[in-house]
Interface confidence: low
């Protein structure tokens, strides 16, 4: 005999108190699969958490963190203060950017310094963990008689730094 509850779709539950008919999930609850005997309470994003996706009758709410904090954990069940400039967040915590990479923000990843020589430029200002290098004029432009200084080339699209 087929379980009558198996016919109840997501967004409903099989109500034992009402002859196993499919009742819609009450407010602030959801069921993401069919055949459920109860609906789960929606996750509430409070305090340092903010709502990224509202709860619906078929899916739970999703949270992220308020400005100045970042998610920790696969389901963003924790919020932690952002890293400092010159760092990136890894599973091992906030880590300083490796030599040759930088991060000028409190979130995101460390990115490689611009390679000035790819554009035929020289390094005008060395890079740090917090700042990209500044490219200057090409060596040829610095020779006597050069008429103008070429403005620095825009930084290339950053790639991921190896960790």
């Amino acid at each position: 005999l087929q379980d009558p509850c198996s016919n109840c779709p997501a967004g409903t539950f099989c109500d034992n108190n009402r002859n196993q008919i499919c009742s819609p999930c009450p407010p602030n609850s959801f069921s993401s699969a069919g055949g459920q005997r109860t609906c789960d309470i929606c996750r509430q994003c409070k305090g340092v958490f903010r709502t990224r996706k509202e709860c619906s009758s078929t899916s739970n709410a999703e949270c992220d963190c308020t400005p100045g904090f970042h998610c920790l954990g696969a389901g963003c069940s924790m919020c932690e203060q952002d890293c400092k400039q010159g760092q990136e967040l890894t599973k091992k915590g906030c880590k300083d950017c490796c030599f040759g990479t930088f991060n000028d923000q409190k979130r995101g990843i460390c990115r490689p310094w611009t390679n000035c020589s790819l554009d035929g430029k020289s390094v005008l200002v060395n890079g740090t963990k917090e700042r990209d290098v500044v490219c200057g004029p090409s060596p040829a432009d610095l020779s006597p008689g050069a008429s103008s200084v070429t403005p620095p080339a825009p930084a290339r699209e950053p790639g991921h730094s190896p960790q």
Epitope: G73, A74, S77, K91, G93
Partner: antibody
Framework: EVQLQQSGAEVKKPGATVKLSCKAS????????IHWVNQRPGQGLEWIGR????????AYAPKFQDRATLTVDTSTNTAYLELSSLRSEDTAVYYC??????????WGQGTTVTVSS | QIVLTQSPATLSASPGERVTLSCTAS???????LHWYQQKPGSSPKLWIY???NLASGVPARFSGSGPGTSYTLTISSMEPEDAATYYC?????????FGQGTKLEIK
């Protein structure tokens, strides 16, 4: 949606080996440690070990050092626990859980392993 | 390894009652690495409080956590029926990570 889907229940004889799987979806397994924790019937939680899928770094609890092997297949986003030389006291629910440098935050549904002759 | 001892083993509380669960560590644990999990029968544990006093996402505000060093507490300001569960403290300060034996909280 973030999920850790664990393999089905296993019944094994003493001395046998069991290999459990834990498939991650909704996130990249390389971004987190994967821990394994067991819970014997009516008992508390016990840490077995963890693996960093990014670089293969592994740590085991001393109790499981000689019998547990943690592996990961990053191409399928799946982590594995192999436990050898099974004995009756290994009868337990085995959980995989994601973690970072200080907590375990998201847990699979668990796999029941029964060791019986 | 760090041993975590929880007390009481079982506690029965009435709705609306204030509840305090205790976790004592055999040696000092940094507050950043002391967490609490909630587990209901037949379900996986859920991270409940992290780093001593921070509520995990979705945890009701009636829960709080406190404690430095070796003595930590989880408090429920006003017990609700859905709070009936087993609560485990957990340290990740020293390897191997360890759990307390759990406190089973029942509703009267």
């Amino acid at each position: 949606e973030v999920q850790l889907q664990q393999s089905g229940a296993e019944v094994k004889k003493p001395g046998a080996t069991v290999k459990l799987s834990c498939k991650a979806s909704g996130f990249n397994i390389k971004d987190y440690y994967i821990h394994w924790v067991n819970q014997r019937p009516g008992q508390g939680l016990e840490w077995i070990g963890r693996i960093d899928p990014e670089d293969g770094d592994i740590a085991y609890a001393p109790k499981f050092q000689d019998r547990a092997t943690l592996t990961v297949d990053t191409s399928t986003n799946t982590a594995y626990l192999e436990l050898s030389s099974l004995r009756s006291e290994d009868t337990a629910v085995y959980y995989c859980t994601t973690g970072n440098y200080y907590a375990m935050d998201f847990w699979g549904q668990g796999t029941t392993v029964t060791v019986s002759s | 390894q760090i041993v975590l001892t929880q007390s009481p083993a079982t506690l029965s509380a009435s709705p609306g009652e204030r509840v305090t669960l205790s976790c004592t560590a055999s040696s000092s644990v940094s507050s950043s690495y002391l967490h609490w999990y909630q587990q209901k029968p037949g379900s996986s544990p859920k991270l409940w409080i992290y780093s001593t006093s921070n509520l995990a996402s979705g945890v009701p505000a009636r829960f709080s956590g406190s404690g430095p060093g070796t003595s930590y507490t989880l408090t429920i300001s006003s017990m609700e029926p859905e709070d009936a569960a087993t609560y485990y403290c957990h340290q990740y300060h020293r390897s191997p990570p360890t759990f307390g034996q759990g406190t089973k909280l029942e509703i009267k």
